[in-house]
Interface confidence: medium
């Protein structure tokens, strides 16, 4: 069956060194346990995180994301997942795309991450 993929409409903000969560879901909601689910960076789609065959495919990640991501799957039965990125870097700023693939059918949603410096401040006056 067909579905839409929905991600956050507004940019998500994170501080360098912090964790950030990027939510993504399918509509209408359905069990995505058997689907391929992942995140990549446009334009040429380096793998940020890939879930396939019922498990996370850690070995397929781009080296800069290895060990820094976790797919939160508590609600995958309802078609909802969240990508957690740890130790956010400035290089993480920009576009991410989340996708769900069910056999031959694939849909995706783009989202944006803004990364800020926790030590940047403007003196008053």
């Amino acid at each position: 069956g067909q579905f839409r993929v929905i991600g956050p409409r507004h940019p998500i903000r994170a501080l360098v060194g912090d964790e950030v969560e990027l939510p993504c879901r399918i509509s209408p909601g359905k069990n995505a346990t058997g689907m391929e689910v992942g995140w990549y960076r446009p334009p040429f789609s380096r793998v940020v995180h890939l879930y396939r065959n019922g498990k996370d495919q850690d070995g397929d990640q781009a080296p800069e994301y290895r060990g820094r991501t976790e797919l939160l799957k508590d609600a995958i039965g309802e078609g909802k997942v969240t990508l957690r990125i740890r130790n956010v870097r400035f290089s993480d700023e920009g576009g991410f795309t989340c996708f769900f693939r069910d056999h031959s059918y694939q849909e995706e949603a783009a989202m944006e991450l803004k990364v800020e410096d926790p030590f940047y401040w403007v003196s008053p006056g």
Partner: antibody, heavy 118, light 108 residues
Framework: QVQLQQWGAGLLKPSETLSLTCAVY????????WSWIRQPPGKGLEWIGD???????NYNPSLKSRVTMSVDTSKNQFSLNLNSVTAADTAVYYC????????????WGQGTLVTVSS | EIVLTQSPATLSLSPGERATLSCRAS???????LAWYQQKPGQAPRLLIY???SRATGIPDRFSGSGSGTDFTLTISRLEPEDFAVYYC?????????FGGGTKVEIK
């Protein structure tokens, strides 16, 4: 700069197994899908399938029953086996790199002409 | 599977002329999932356009892509001698990944 270099037998008899290998130089297998595409003489391109660093595969249903792909991460190589070949499998075979989402082929090997003839 | 039909099969033009190549899909393709490649004799294809309209790195701005749904177009605004080649479209909207049959742009 990442480069793909491929090799394998160029002349086969019907019913034999085609075997090709592609090496990735200057980069990692991680983060991309690694594909095989073929082109019969004077004809268009056909996607055969692809494999990831961890060995997950996608195959074209039209060839799935005869195709096996494998990866050797220690050598930064991936391979294609196509069994029970016929003259219809005569083609230039290319290895290529594609992204997971956009699925465009942004890097290609030089191609290997494989001829099947009795 | 999605069938991509390219037309014309051959386009005979002179350097400096404008080339318009068509790619028609058997069912709707998201514009994010349509790419164009150039192939010269004895060489591997080279990515020109991805996402229907974005030029790949190093591709001159005389190449442009457009379209949506089932109809996509590659335009070469002014043909240079090195542009005479075969051009293929490719989709990833549905699996398996498929290519069009190609359009040969030849010197008139």
């Amino acid at each position: 700069q990442v480069q793909l270099q491929q090799w394998g037998a160029g002349l086969l008899k019907p019913s034999e197994t085609l075997s090709l290998t592609c090496a990735v130089y200057g980069g990692s297998l991680s983060g991309y899908y690694w594909s095989w595409i073929r082109q019969p003489p004077g004809k268009g391109l056909e996607w055969i399938g692809d494999i990831t660093h961890s060995g997950s595969t996608n195959y074209n249903p039209s060839l799935k029953s005869r195709v096996t792909m494998s990866v050797d991460t220690s050598k930064n190589q991936f391979s294609l086996n196509l069994n029970s070949v016929t003259a219809a499998d005569t083609a230039v075979y290319y290895c290529a790199r594609r992204g997971i989402g956009a699925a465009v082929f942004d890097l290609w090997g030089q191609g290997t002409l494989v001829t099947v003839s009795s | 599977e999605i069938v991509l039909t390219q037309s014309p099969a051959t386009l005979s033009l002179s350097p400096g002329e404008r080339a318009t190549l068509s790619c028609r899909a058997s069912q709707s393709v998201s514009s994010s999932y349509l790419a164009w490649y150039q192939q010269k004799p004895g060489q591997a294809p080279r990515l020109l356009i991805y996402g229907a309209s974005s030029r790949a790195t190093g591709i001159p701005d005389r190449f442009s892509g457009s379209g949506s749904g089932t109809d996509f177009t590659l335009t070469i605004s002014r043909l240079e001698p090195e542009d005479f080649a075969v051009y293929y479209c490719q989709q990833r909207s549905n699996w398996p990944l498929t290519f069009g049959g190609g359009t040969k742009v030849e010197i008139k």
